[in-house]
Amino acid sequence: AGHLEQPQISSTKTLSKTARLECVVSGITISATSVYWYRERPGEVIQFLVSISYDGTVRKESGIPSGKFEVDRIPETSTSTLTIHNVEKQDIATYYCALWEAQQELGKKIKVFGPGTKLIITDKQLDADVSPKPTIFLPSIAETKLQKAGTYLCLLEKFFPDVIKIHWQEKKSNTILGSQEGNTMKTNDTYMKFSWLTVPEKSLDKEHRCIVRHENNKNGVDQEIIFPPIKTDVITMDPKDNCSKDANDTLLLQLTNTSA
Amino acid sequence: AIELVPEHQTVPVSIGVPATLRCSMKGEAIGNYYINWYRKTQGNTMTFIYREKDIYGPGFKDNFQGDIDIAKNLAVLKILAPSERDEGSYYCACDTLGMGGEYTDKLIFGKGTRVTVEPRSQPHTKPSVFVMKNGTNVACLVKEFYPKDIRINLVSSKKITEFDPAIVISPSGKYNAVKLGKYEDSNSVTCSVQHDNKTVHSTDFEVKTDSTDHVKPKETENTKQPSKSCHKPKAIVHTEKVNMMSLTV
């Protein structure tokens, strides 16, 4: 089955610059399919923009300004790129790549979409580091004792732009856990968001990870925030693993004598 | 030009109570096109639900039913037993791929219908209230309450800033909420909640324990701990980025 990944969840540009949005195709040979690009402007319907067919033919929607969009594909990396020239505020939108995928039954096809990339235009000079800054909250003793469950909370602050994705996993597992989150909130010129995960008592002795995707993450990779195992009988960090690490790889643990 | 027009911009649904979305086609006969339905959830993920010819996306066949009313020129999508996972914006779209003759392989979309999911009516449930702390940050966790109406108060004489609470549906079909704030005196912050004309305090849930039960660190003790495993995370979180871990004792 075809799968589309758009690695950039957002792309922030200043006016008149060029934006390049990527779409990675897997599960199907890119040179054997057509890739379509759609945009969803705020308050408008999702609109077809341009497509590139298996033989490289480009088709643009009528009424789309000439010279504004360019589409290509790179078979070696199985990638299609949408280039938006001379960005202006009317280009603010979420851009989706899509492709027709054949179903098992002959003649049945569906169009699958990538997760989208939001194009953001700014005229602000922001601080050098506008990646999400995490703060972690561990379960309260009251919750673990009374409810035989514990809630981890992952707070992310001082990031720009506002587009962010958060999910949770147990260590050594790729299963995404069911979590809950608040709305993204504006604080001065940046944003904050929090997500929380409630796990049953039997999972409290496992390490959990809050995984954050953001345009300005260091080196462009997902940020993983580690939540240590919790002992419900003795609240301390699990010392069983003793890997040596660089000093700058450590987390600072503040043990405070607080109630609740 | 073809236009697809949803019947409603917003449709509130209750968990487990069937709901119907409708989308009419203007300017053309709906029978000349294939109708598709998509759902966009938080984070912009566009998921395929249904396409004419009885094609359903993975996991949708049991809980969704697509239909066309040729006489009324409209498409219908039924959500048979909505759950909180079904919240999102639903889009109808049309194409003529595979119809032969004049065909379009692009999709023409209508505007979205926002489906909001509410728990079904149920007996009132009092919340549990817990406080979590880290440095100047305090979170008040309010669990498993019904109905939704609630006021969460973080009690402190030295507030730096507070944020609007997040109120969401819990997996059990009630509500959970979290309110966050920053306080100079975070150690003394408690949380009180007004719900159903009653007040619930976080202190009501504090556990009285023997000193043997827990590690009791010295007030000022800060320790550096190695990371828990040899696995190198994709992005290392440095100490300046994590406002410390807080073990509440």
Partner: antibody
């Protein structure tokens, strides 16, 4: 000081043409979406047309679509409105207005010209 | 097509609070703004993006927006505030103005 000065208005017969100009000064013209708004005598404001910063996008009110053409010359700091097939109901004061929202998906007009009167009458 | 509705006229005594409403479908999502226009003059922006005030606009002007209604509030209304007021929003590829409200200061 931001200034927008319209010119080119006047009396024209139904079916005739007119070209309005707007000279901008006191700000960097090129990044801004520019607009024409009109006001018939004794009536309210009616948006006519918008043009994006690099002329990629032009939008028109239904009432003028196919008859009016908006354009701009960033080198000359100028905005234009070519009005063809004029009708009596096009009689109005035409204002040139700057869109104050440079980078957001909203529109508000933070500076307006003094307006130029277009009268369509036989 | 999208429409914004305003009352044709509102009267207020000097020093009192004047409220002018503007209603339209899902207006809360559309960032309403407000203009003041005095006879023979060009419009002046007084509120944008629901509740922001351009520099030079007195603090007595404020805006709010929720659901289907945007409201322009003038607290401590002065005689000089007598004018026509227009709300405006943006829908899809169209800019829409309300019909205007004549504010009379008695």
């Amino acid at each position: 000081e931001v200034q927008l000065v319209e010119s080119g208005g006047g009396l024209v017969k139904p079916g005739g043409s007119l070209r309005l100009s707007c000279a901008a000064s006191g700000f960097t013209f090129s990044p801004y979406t520019m607009n024409w708004v009109r006001q018939a005598p004794g009536k309210g404001l009616e948006w006519v047309s918008s043009i994006s910063s690099s002329s990629s996008y032009m939008y028109y009110a239904d009432s003028v679509k196919g008859r009016f053409t908006i354009s701009r010359d960033n080198a000359k700091n100028s905005l234009y409105l070519q009005m063809n097939s004029l009708r009596a109901e096009d009689t109005a004061v035409y204002y040139c207005a700057r869109d104050g929202d440079l980078v957001g998906p909203t529109y508000y007009f933070d500076y307006w010209g003094q307006g130029t009167l277009v009268t369509v009458s036989s | 097509s999208y429409e914004l509705m305003q009352p044709p006229s509102v009267s207020v005594s000097p020093g009192q609070t004047a409220s002018i409403t503007c209603s339209g479908d899902k207006l809360g999502d559309k960032y309403a703004c407000w203009y003041q226009q005095k006879p023979g003059q060009s419009p002046v922006l007084v509120i944008y993006q629901h509740n922001k005030r351009p520099s030079g606009i007195p603090e007595r002007f404020s805006g709010s927006n929720s659901g289907k209604t945007a409201t322009l509030t003038i607290s401590g209304t002065q005689a000089m505030d007598e004018a026509d007021y227009y709300c405006q929003a943006w829908d899809s590829t169209t800019v829409v103005f309300g019909g205007g409200t004549k504010l009379t200061v008695l």
